[in-house]
């Protein structure tokens, strides 16, 4: 899909403003918050999506054990700084000059410091573990059906190359989806696993980023998969640097 010519909207990002002011009167879409032009044939980067979200009016078999270095996004929403390509800048600061380093999915990976804090590089998140608990059903889902449908979802809805969906684990009622993508594996044009995971997370919460009817209806052999809880663990190519105080808290 590209931006639809007839009504000029962005199929892959509803947090955009679109107008036919591109070359030859073509539809061009810009992300809210940053004003950056986005490619509506693929997913928008998480950084631009978070920025758009902050600018929008506020509404009143064996399961994997995450490694000791796995990060969970406990800090929640913030207004990020994005680079010209829409990626997170390695160092993020708030309005009170408190700064911290983030990974490629925008999750804090150091203690908070002041403006003197240095973040030498944007560290890549190469392994994402999505941990879901589904609502009780009459019986367990068939593992192979569940695996096939989740792989199809990531391939067709999020346009993530199948090789990056490393595994789907299932022990009722827990589902785990493992996404893996090293720097060396990611070719130009490949969807980033962090972006795919973010779109999936928003879909599961009923906050779809796609234009359309506003909900993900995920079915396994006709039965809706209703997710009660979502936890996402992020593993970076270089382990995070937190003080011992935080690690023992």
């Amino acid at each position: 899909h590209t931006a639809a010519q007839d009504n000029c909207t962005c199929p892959t990002n509803k947090m955009t403003v679109c107008s036919p002011d591109g070359p030859g009167g073509r539809c061009q879409c810009r992300a809210l918050g940053s004003g950056m032009a986005v490619d509506c044939s693929t997913l928008t980067s998480k950084c631009l999506l978070l920025k758009a979200r902050m600018s929008a009016p506020k509404n009143a078999r064996t399961l994997v054990r995450p490694s000791e270095h796995a990060l969970v996004d406990n800090d929640g929403l913030y207004d990020p700084d994005c680079d010209p390509e829409g990626r997170f800048k390695a160092r993020q600061c708030n309005q009170t000059s408190v700064c911290w380093c983030v990974n490629s999915v925008g999750v804090r990976r150091t203690d908070k410091g002041d403006l003197s804090l240095r973040c030498d590089e944007l560290v890549r998140t190469h392994h994402i573990l999505i941990d879901l608990r589904h609502r009780p059903t009459a019986g367990a889902f068939n593992h192979s059906d569940l695996d096939a449908e989740l792989r199809r979802l990531f391939r067709e809805r999020y346009r993530l190359h199948p090789k990056f969906v490393a595994a789907v684990h299932y022990e009722q009622p827990t589902i785990q989806i493992e996404l893996r993508q090293n720097t060396s594996q990611k070719a130009a044009g490949d969807v980033d696993i962090g972006d795919a995971a973010y779109y999936f997370e928003r879909d599961i919460k009923g906050e779809s980023l796609f234009q359309g009817r506003g909900g993900l209806d995920l079915r396994v052999r006709g039965e809706p998969l209703q997710v009660e809880r979502t936890l996402i663990y992020y593993l970076d190519e270089i382990p995070p640097k937190f003080s011992m105080k935080r690690l023992t808290a």
Epitope: R135, D145, A148, E149, R152, L153, E156, R157, D203, I204, K205, G206, F210, G212, R213, G214, G215, L216, D217, L218, R219, R221, G222, E223, P224, Q226, V227, E228
Partner: antibody, heavy 119, light 112 residues
Amino acid sequence: QVQLQESGPGLVKPSETLSLTCTVSGFSLTSYGVNWIRQPPGKGLEWIGVMWAGGSTNYNSALMSRLTISKDTSKNQFSLKLSSVTAADTAVYYCARDENWDGAWFAYWGQGTLVTVSS
Amino acid sequence: DIVMTQSPDSLAVSLGERATINCKSSQSLLNSGTRKNYLAWYQQKPGQPPKLLISWASSRESGVPDRFSGSGSGTDFTLTISSLQAEDVAVYYCKQSYNLFTFGGGTKVEIK
């Protein structure tokens, strides 16, 4: 542009098998499923069954023993077979696209084909 | 199987007046995770296939006039036509997709 078109014999004899085809265009059969719905003359809508994008099927429990839904991706066609028909199976038969992950709504329908069961 | 019960069976309303159609399901259609209801409303005019009006109980489809609105949650749902127009004469159906699919019996809307 999304289109669905039902086709098949307009008249079927009692106890025989009703066979219908739904030919689609404008979308991939691996990305969307197709439902069959019927409507007896002057009556309401009854869901018959679905073939999901992944290839699995679900049928209306009242019709399950007589029903088969399949697809031929190379021909862009879905087919419905209903065996041992009676006059109660006389209806307009519709096929409709499932909206995949955007909700199981039927946003695109064929125009329908009337099937009469009579000797 | 989930049973969908619509009321009334038929409804005669003056042009410009409000028309209200009710739909009750035999079990809740609410997805507690996404807080969305698996309910749709369709309009069918004579000799035509049904047309999707409302999805997720209250989301109006693009191109559907804003005089049509859907409300409700769980087991009780309502379709409201705020100001009936001549072109709204049709049969209206609710449909659940929480557990496969079931249509309500339909409500015929006419002009008084």
